[in-house]
């Protein structure tokens, strides 16, 4: 014959544990029902009556089967530098993540406690490592033969165009200017040019296979900077 199913509350066999979605009540010394997610224990069980559950109130939640006397409060509303990626319901907490152009400088169990604006690389510097949800942009000086004339959290250093005849040599923050209407060739569009190891800009040691390549790469004027993001600390 199959063993009889015990209904809560019941006294567990010595040395055994309560079943899934049950808990052992120390006071009643019985196995009692847990409350489902979105509920909490309004009345704890006794030897003769099971747990009485009730729904969580607005702005509170329980995510797991539980026997807590009160639901947990949802986190405060997301700040202006965040977006709500999960709403507060009876069964889940609100989750705030950083809005585009920001990263999480201080995380919490779920979501982000403190967002910070992604660093913008100034002219003469390019993005060497892009920002992620949890890490800032890393800016590095443009290597010889490359430039960035923007203030940006996404722009990398781009190669100078190569001219038949150079009107103005390129540098770290300005492309070469050609005398003719079009350059002889340009590096592959979209090619990633991160700073190169052991290049010494001021000594002009970059290879110059054609006399028309721009020799000088010290910083020069940027083209239209954008102001720092609000709340930026420059870290």
């Amino acid at each position: 014959l199959p063993a009889q199913v015990a209904f809560t509350p019941y006294a567990p066999e010595p040395g055994s544990t309560c079943r899934l979605r049950e808990y052992y009540d120390q006071t009643a010394q019985m196995c009692c029902s847990k409350c489902s997610p979105g509920q909490h224990a309004k009345v704890f069980c006794t030897k003769t009556s099971d747990t009485v559950c009730d729904s969580c109130e607005d702005s509170t939640y329980t995510q797991l089967w539980n026997w807590v006397p009160e639901c947990l409060s949802c986190g405060s509303r997301c700040s202006s530098d965040q977006v709500e990626t999960q709403a507060c319901t009876r069964e889940q907490n609100r989750i705030c993540t950083c809005r585009p152009g920001w990263y999480c400088a201080l995380s919490k169990q779920e979501g982000c406690r403190l967002c910070a604006p992604l660093r913008k690389c100034r002219p003469g510097f390019g993005v060497a490592r892009p920002g992620t949800e949890t890490s800032d942009v890393v800016c590095k000086p443009c290597a010889p033969g490359t430039f960035s004339n923007t203030t940006s959290s996404t722009d990398i250093c781009r190669p100078h165009q190569i001219c038949n005849v150079v009107a103005i040599p390129g540098n770290a923050s300005m492309d070469a200017v050609c005398t003719s209407t079009s350059p002889t060739r340009s590096m592959a569009p979209g090619a990633v040019h991160l700073p190169q190891p052991v290049s010494t800009r001021s000594q002009h040691t970059q290879p110059t296979p054609e006399p028309s390549t721009a020799p000088s790469t010290s910083f020069l004027l940027p083209m239209g900077p954008s102001p720092p993001a609000e709340g930026s600390t420059g870290d």
């Epitope: 660093r119 510097f125 800016c139 000086p141 004027l221 720092p228 930026s232 870290d235």
Partner: antibody, heavy 119, light 106 residues
Framework: EVQLQQSGPEVGRPGSSVKISCKAS????????MHWVKQSPGQGLEWIGW????????DYAEKFKKKATLTADTSSNTAYIQLSSLTSEDTATYFC????????????WGQGVMVTVSS | DIQMTQSPPSLSASLGDKVTITCQAS??????IAWYQQKPGKAPRLLIR???TLESGTPSRFSGSGSGRDYSFSISNVESEDIASYYC????????FGAGTKLEIK
């Protein structure tokens, strides 16, 4: 907490060289370039140059191209400046300062190292 | 290279005064100017970056403004702790400091 700890004062003979250090802590050393700045006694600040610890690349003010050599050691998070062919003109305090390549150059500085050139 | 002409070289002010220091660049620096305070025997301290953005911990009595080639730095209500030298720095074309301004109290 970000800190740039520089080595102690140096005395050098004319014609000799000195190498001073700047040990970084509290941040990712390779994410920032390191500048060096000279301040002669009672004078203003002069930019010497920078080193990128990650790649070893450097740039110098024209005036210091033959005088200073900037290097960095990522294993010890330390940047160095070597001053060669010392003369009395090199007697000064030398500062290191980091730069994030964004809006805040020199947001943290070392305490400075006094180099005295004397025979 | 860009030159930075800073004036005046020295300033004498009474407590509570407003003082202004100017820096003129030899060419347009597109707001890439920072201001530093240096007290005797100490390293400089960044006060203002990108013309007018106060660094964290910089008192609100400090301010900066300007564009193109001309920039200014002001202390609106001078306090005794402001006795120091002040330097501008352009950081768009390599880096160049101004010659400095020494602030004294009358």
């Amino acid at each position: 907490e970000v800190q740039l700890q520089q080595s102690g004062p140096e005395v050098g003979r004319p014609g000799s060289s000195v190498k001073i250090s700047c040990k970084a802590s509290g941040y990712t050393f390779t994410d920032y370039i390191m500048h060096w700045v000279k301040q002669s006694p009672g004078q203003g600040l002069e930019w010497i140059g920078w080193v990128d610890p990650e790649y070893g690349s450097t740039d110098y003010a024209e005036k210091f191209k033959k005088k200073a050599t900037l290097t960095a050691d990522t294993s010890s998070n330390t940047a160095y400046i070597q001053l060669s062919s010392l003369t009395s003109e090199d007697t000064a305090t030398y500062f290191c300062a980091r730069d994030d390549g964004s809006y805040s150059p020199f947001d943290y500085w070392g305490q400075g190292v006094m180099v005295t050139v004397s025979s | 290279d860009i030159q930075m002409t800073q004036s005046p070289p020295s300033l004498s002010a009474s407590l509570g005064d407003k003082v202004t220091i100017t820096c003129q660049a030899s060419q347009n620096i597109n707001k890439y100017i920072a201001w530093y305070q240096q007290k005797p025997g100490k390293a400089p301290r960044l006060l203002i970056r990108y013309t007018s953005t106060l660094e964290s911990g910089t008192p609100s009595r400090f301010s900066g403004s300007g564009s193109g080639r001309d920039y200014s730095f002001s202390i609106s209500n001078v306090e005794s702790e402001d006795i120091a030298s002040y330097y501008c720095l352009q950081y768009v074309n390599l880096l160049t400091f101004g010659a400095g301004t020494k602030l004294e109290i009358k």
